[in-house]
């Protein structure tokens, strides 16, 4: 149990203890949400106090002060997902339609997602906002006809499901064109029934 002497300048629990060179001892760090209000000595361990309002310390530490809670910067494309607490800084993420363009331990700057051209869609990512769009072609039987960062490929219309016949096959960029079986010329319609 700290404090205890250490000749080799290392402590048994690196996460929760630190080496104090003046006394050549290992002392307790303060837990998240607290700071050092009185430093340790040979006879007394570190005394910790809770971070004041609007401040935090995230890790086991031997800081004599807490960090200022800061907002997510909207100009950098960030939005808040969880407020600051004594144990955790404000949690931020990229605003919808944006991705993280600069990373320094955490995201510091988001940019607009690139458009995916017609015939493609953005590959689904595990985590929203982590990277720019990677556009992949629509799979067979699907189409996407806009330039958009978020549009998804849709299945081609099945003319027979609507009692129609195919006038023009669908492509990656356009839907199937259907016509009434009794009509000789196909109308300029995409996947809709002519009444």
């Amino acid at each position: 149990v700290p404090p205890y002497g250490s000749e080799n300048q290392t402590c048994r629990d690196q996460e929760k203890e630190y080496y104090e060179p003046r006394h050549r001892i290992c002392c307790s760090r303060c837990p998240p949400g607290t700071y050092v209000s009185a430093k340790c000595s040979r006879s007394r361990d570190t005394v910790c106090a809770t971070c004041a309002e609007n401040s935090y310390n995230e890790h086991w530490n031997y800081l004599t002060i807490c960090q200022l809670c800061r907002p997510c910067d909207p100009v950098m494309g960030l939005e808040e997902i969880a407020p600051c607490t004594s144990k955790r800084k404000t949690q931020c993420r990229c605003q919808p339609g944006m991705f993280c363009a600069a990373w320094a331990l955490e995201c510091t700057h988001c940019e607009l997602l690139s458009d995916c051209p017609p015939g493609t869609e953005a590959e689904l990512k595990d985590e929203v906002g982590k990277g720019n769009n990677h556009c992949v072609p629509c799979k067979a039987g699907h189409f996407q006809n806009t330039s958009s960062p978020s549009a998804r490929c849709q299945p081609h219309t099945r003319c027979e499901d609507q009692g129609l016949v195919e006038a023009a096959p669908g492509t990656a960029q356009s839907d199937t064109t259907c016509r009434n079986p009794s009509e000789s010329l196909p109308p300029e319609m995409s996947g809709t029934m002519l009444m």
Epitope: I65, C69, P71
Partner: antibody, heavy 120, light 113 residues
Framework: QVQLVQSGAEVKKPGSSVKVSCKAS????????ISWVRQAPGQGLEWMGG????????NYAQKFQGRVTITADKSTSTAYMELSSLRSEDTAVYYC?????????????WGQGTTVTVSS | DIVMTQSPDSLAVSLGERATINCKSS????????????LAWYQQKPGQPPKLLIY???TRESGVPDRFSGSGSGTDFTLTISSLQAEDVAVYYC?????????FGQGTKVEIK
């Protein structure tokens, strides 16, 4: 009482580098972010960057990125600001400053300033 | 970065009169979660480093005379010297600490008329 004492005035040639020191006393050096702020003659205040000594991580203003290096020596409670590729526009008073209420809050304590003159 | 713009650039006021300095930020410096404005005011006299006067937009630093007061919220802030004294002749700066990339206004020079 916290005191920040800076190194003396420097005269430098264009293209060279300058390294200004800031020694802290009367407080826990490593727990507070040290900022560097400069002021050209007759001009306003301009934040250059800062460092949290206990973390060792520095943070720079876009304008100075790649030209300024801020470091800290915990053993001597001293912070350093090195500015390279000096030009005449870098002639200014350079201040170090630190907060007191929070690790990285508003700037309460300021050094006396170091005059750097860049001239051929 | 957040741009801070002060007005006027200079101000001449008679002794005992009120001096008002305005500061506008390019984006809000109000954090809605704690309802605090991340704005400070500094005073700088010739040949001296800046001195903190006000933080959280309106909280006076200890030892600062009560003739100095700060007000405002969001993007618009004001520093008021209710009764100008000779020792108040200086340049005044507003500064945001909403981001860790601190920025300052261009300064307002206060002189005696």
């Amino acid at each position: 009482q916290v005191q920040l004492v800076q190194s003396g005035a420097e005269v430098k040639k264009p293209g060279s580098s300058v390294k200004v020191s800031c020694k802290a006393s009367g407080g826990t050096f490593s727990s507070y972010a040290i900022s560097w702020v400069r002021q050209a003659p007759g001009q306003g205040l301009e934040w250059m960057g800062g460092i949290i000594p206990i973390h060792g991580t520095a943070n720079y203003a876009q304008k100075f990125q790649g030209r300024v290096t801020i470091t800290a020596d915990k053993s001597t409670s001293t912070a350093y600001m090195e500015l390279s590729s000096l030009r005449s526009e870098d002639t200014a008073v350079y201040y170090c400053a630190r907060p007191s209420y929070y690790l990285d809050g508003w700037l309460d304590y300021w050094g006396q300033g170091t005059t750097v003159t860049v001239s051929s | 970065d957040i741009v801070m713009t002060q007005s006027p650039d200079s101000l001449a006021v008679s002794l005992g009169e009120r001096a008002t300095i305005n500061c506008k930020s390019s984006q809000s410096v109000l954090y809605s979660s704690n309802n605090k404005n991340y704005l400070a005011w500094y005073q700088q006299k010739p040949g001296q480093p800046p001195k903190l006067l006000i933080y959280w937009a309106s909280t006076r630093e200890s030892g600062v005379p009560d003739r100095f007061s700060g007000s405002g919220s969001g993007t618009d802030f004001t520093l008021t010297i209710s009764s100008l004294q000779a020792e108040d002749v200086a340049v005044y700066y507003c500064s945001q600490y909403y981001t860790t990339h601190y920025t300052f206004g261009q300064g307002t020079k206060v002189e005696i008329k």
